[in-house]
């Protein structure tokens, strides 16, 4: 997977008036890395590993960048003409990537009230607009505003692409991201399935990076793909990931089965525990965490794109 840096900024308006402040999160390699603390008006690292990336350096540069981006986005929202009564949001997601072959990608996406209306490839400067008439109107509105000073805009996009990659390279240089490995915690449970059968579920949690093999083995050999059910590998909100695999087996045959886990060049095997079978089967909920963003998002049901 490529290394990536992802900026996620949102500004709000109420009854046509753009609100002060903004919400911002930065993801590094898909993990929550920074967020903008509106109380302290500063960029704050998300967890110890994020702190380790910059070591003893300050987060002034990040604070300055996020503040500037937030200001720009508020100005953009102010130029959107069709703002009606009530709460509205403008969200900008900017991503840059460095691939294994050292090639790069950068893009920028705008959402209004949770709906994508404008995308741009920051390398080719090519714009993409969804087909809907609302998106077309919004896109024209925003593009016109952004193009008011054509030369400034051209410089602006090249700079955004270059700055994002420069920051990403700076973070990668610390080696923390590249070296970081958190082995999974693995837990096996059993639950009632149907007459004579039980479902055994193997959960792996709190691991990084996200690449993992989790599979059931019978008498030492991996079960075929179609006899197992896998959950998605999802962020768990702590800068790590979680996933699960389940299979249905005959009651009394539990000891023939082992959950096999492989992560970052290491593996482990996890047998099915003996004891009472759980009657209630509780698979993990497949919801995306909002990583502690402002409650207004939850309260106003504003869609958050990840």
């Amino acid at each position: 997977e490529p290394h990536s840096l992802r900026y996620n900024l949102t500004v709000l308006s109420w009854d046509g008036s753009v609100q002060s402040g903004f919400l911002a999160e930065v993801h590094l390699d898909g993990q929550p890395f920074l967020r903008y603390d509106r109380q302290k008006c500063r960029a704050k690292p998300q967890g110890q590993w994020a702190e380790d990336v910059l070591g003893n350096k300050t987060w002034d540069r990040e604070t300055r960048d996020l503040t500037g981006n937030g200001k720009d986005l508020r100005m953009t929202l102010a130029h959107i003409k069709d703002q009606k009564e009530g709460l509205h949001s403008l969200q900008e997601i900017r991503v840059c990537e460095i691939h294994e072959d050292n090639s790069t990608r950068s893009s920028q996406h705008f959402y209004y009230d949770g709906e994508l209306f404008l995308s741009q490839n920051l390398e080719t400067e090519e714009w993409t607009v969804p087909q809907s008439s609302r998106a077309q109107t919004l896109a024209m509105n925003v593009r016109n505003f952004l193009k008011e000073d054509a030369m400034k805009t051209k410089t602006h996009y090249h700079a955004m692409h270059a700055d994002c990659l420069q920051e990403l390279r700076r973070y990668l240089e610390s080696g923390v991201v590249l070296r970081r490995t958190v082995p999974p915690m693995v837990n096996v449970t059993r639950s009632e399935a149907s007459e004579g059968n039980i479902t055994v579920t193997c959960r792996a949690s709190s691991f990084y990076p996200r690449n993992i093999i989790l599979t059931w083995r019978q008498d030492g050999v991996s079960l075929s793909h179609d006899t197992q059910q896998w959950g998605d590998v999802l962020p768990d909100g702590n800068g790590t990931y979680q996933t699960w695999v389940a299979t249905r087996i005959c009651r009394g045959e539990e000891q023939r089965f082992t959950c096999y886990m492989e992560h970052s060049g290491n593996h482990s095997t996890h047998p099915v525990p003996s004891g009472k079978v759980l009657v209630l089967q509780s698979h993990w909920q497949h919801h995306h965490h909002h990583h502690g963003l402002n409650d207004i998002f939850e309260a106003q049901k504003i869609e958050w794109h990840e």
């Epitope: 093999i213 083995r217 019978q218 008498d219 030492g220 050999v221 991996s222 000891q255 023939r256 089965f257 082992t258 492989e262 060049g265 290491n266 593996h267 482990s268 095997t269 996890h270 047998p271 099915v272 525990p273 003996s274 004891g275």
Partner: antibody
Framework: QVQLQQSGAELVRPGTSVKVSCKAS????????IEWVKQRPGQGLEWIGG????????NYNEKFKGKAILTADKSSSTAYMQLSSLTSDDSAVYFC??????????WGQGTTLTVSS | DILLTQSPASLSASVGETVTITCRAS??????LAWYQQKQGKSPQLLVY???TLADGVPSRFSGSGSGTQYSLKINSLQPEDFGSYYC?????????FGGGTKLEIK
């Protein structure tokens, strides 16, 4: 039939390294995990670690991390264990074995390692 | 790490006798216990796995039992070929440890 054929006895100097091999036959080599076990003269058995020959992933007993390195060659259906910085404490018989789920079903015949100056 | 305590460490018995070897785990190993027999200069041979399942080709005079933390291997009507060392091993969580062994000798 399943067979695990280990390399012959080794007499080596302290401080050097040695690589013990374990050639599997009679089954699909990449389907099963291979484990390694140490037995000092007149002593009990100690699990060193295991390898998945298909992927090369390993699982070590903490005690043997830095001492043993497990590898496997799919093309020759052979698992290897390299032991480094040898001392007299490493003098032992080393067994490879096939993990048949939640037990070891098949064992190699053992390789005797003697570390002596 | 789970510690397996095997007893007795050595045992003298006559052909035809019945003997029992026990293996106590320091934690619940959920029946993931195997028993092996080892003759001098040879590799261990699987006798019993999953605490009570007899491996292929193992005579029925051998039997395994137990659960939780307490397990035992029973040999009925000892035969001359049964003499040697016996080890238990758990497979609940790594490191997979062995018991200290029981040396069964002819009286």
């Amino acid at each position: 039939q399943v067979q695990l054929q280990q390399s012959g006895a080794e007499l080596v100097r302290p401080g050097t390294s040695v690589k013990v091999s374990c050639k599997a036959s009679g089954y699909a080599f990449t389907d099963y995990l291979i484990e390694w076990v140490k037995q000092r003269p007149g002593q009990g058995l100690e699990w060193i670690g295991g390898i998945n020959p298909g992927s090369g992933s390993t699982n070590y007993n903490e005690k043997f991390k830095g001492k043993a390195i497990l590898t496997a060659d799919k093309s020759s259906s052979t698992a290897y264990m390299q032991l480094s910085s040898l001392t007299s404490d490493d003098s032992a018989v080393y067994f490879c074995a096939r993990l048949d789920g939640n037990y070891v079903g098949y064992w190699g015949q053992g390789t005797t390692l003697t570390v002596s100056s | 790490d789970i510690l397996l305590t095997q007893s007795p460490a050595s045992l003298s018995a006559s052909v035809g006798e019945t003997v029992t070897i026990t293996c106590r785990a320091s934690g619940n190993i959920h029946n993931y216990l195997a028993w092996y027999q080892q003759k001098q200069g040879k590799s261990p041979q699987l006798l019993v796995y999953h605490a009570k399942t007899l491996a292929d080709g193992v005579p029925s005079r051998f039997s395994g039992s137990g659960s939780g933390t307490q397990y035992s291997l029973k040999i009925n009507s000892l035969q001359p070929e049964d003499f040697g060392s016996y080890y238990c091993q758990h497979f609940w969580s790594t490191p997979w440890t062995f018991g200290g062994g029981t040396k069964l000798e002819i009286k």
